[in-house]
């Protein structure tokens, strides 16, 4: 019957994620009992995405690799609301890599998921970015301006933020 086949589909979908995410936290979306959205435990959720704060100190390339083995990417921030959500889980004395880089050092910033870089939706600290050798972006806290972005050398180890689409079952 319909419910049985739906359950079988859900189980096979869950098996796909089991290698890196042995536990999922799911919530019912809307009123329909058949629509569940899930994030790996202990990731946090906001709108249609899941977020993970990685506390290991890694270069930008390795931070992105670390996210990718979990089925995610370094975070792409699309709105002020999204950034406001993310910063609730960050420590003020730490810096975190974003999925934003300038590989050629020509100030052509690009997001890891190919989302177009929009100058109007950026949250650089004042005076940033300021160095052509600093080709990767972090988010950090400055007492004068709170949370914002800064360019940094990609090899300097930092913490990072991973983002993935919610898993719908």
């Amino acid at each position: 019957n319909f419910m049985y086949s739906k359950t079988v589909k859900r189980l096979s979908k869950l098996r796909e994620y089991q290698q890196y995410h042995p536990s999922l936290t799911c919530v019912m979306e809307g009123k329909d009992i058949e629509d569940w959205s899930c994030c790996p435990t202990p990731w946090t959720s906001f709108q249609s995405s899941c977020y993970f704060i990685s506390t290991g100190m890694q270069s930008w390339t390795k931070s992105q690799k670390n996210c990718s083995v979990m089925g995610a990417d370094l975070v792409v921030i699309n709105t002020r609301e999204e950034q406001d959500f993310i910063i609730q889980n960050l420590k003020r004395n730490s810096s975190y890599f974003l999925g934003l880089s300038d590989p050629g050092g020509r100030r052509h910033w690009q997001w890891v998921d190919q989302t177009p870089y929009n100058e109007n939706v950026t949250f650089w600290h004042s005076g940033e970015p300021n160095n052509l050798d600093e080709r990767c972006a972090i988010i950090n806290f400055r007492s004068s301006e709170e949370w914002g972005w800064n360019d940094i050398h990609c090899h300097v180890p930092q913490k990072s933020i991973c983002k993935m689409k919610k898993i719908y079952i």
Partner: antibody, heavy 118, light 107 residues
Amino acid sequence: QVQLVQSGAEVKKPGASVKVSCKASGYTFTSYLIHWVRQAPGQGLEWMGTIYPGGGDTSYNQKFKGRVTMTRDTSTSTVYMELSSLRSEDTAVYYCARMGDNEYFDYWGQGTLVTVSS
Amino acid sequence: DIQMTQSPSSLSASVGDRVTITCRASGNIHNYLAWYQQKPGKAPKLLLYDAETLAEGVPSRFSGSGSGTDYTLTISSLQPEDFATYYCQHFWSTPYTFGGGTKVEIK
């Protein structure tokens, strides 16, 4: 050609501090991270931390946090590693190494022997 | 922190021998591994990086392989100048720890 030239040997008393220098030449000093690695007599290698000469950003091995400070002087293309509260176990050869584009240590200094003895 | 366990700690071999040194990481280091050669009183010299890429100027008798947690350095035909101590080092996340070293001595 790329060269990292370190300061000379030091003898220090327990509790004192030592500051070792590493002068870089043959490349753009501010574009590459410098790491510090030490080696106790007859022992293996131990990573201490790194500094980015362009912005001064540092990352230290937790084992040395609070005792190690890495700084740089861009006018002389020199990086410094200062280790405080020295004890006999800190007797070692201290190396600086450049991290190349491939994110590995491609050039090393000749080493600086620091002896801690009362 | 990721620990690196290198074996053997020492070995005796003759010129022309094939020599294999292994390095095991306590976690997946995704091939971010370097091998160094060190001679007494000298700084380490980079031999291989990314587990299997030969550094500039390094003879082709040196090769590396492995993935995940297990890695190998092979010297296909040992030469007199290869008698030295060899170290592995991971670069996955800080601290970038080294293996304990393998001393290759003349038999």
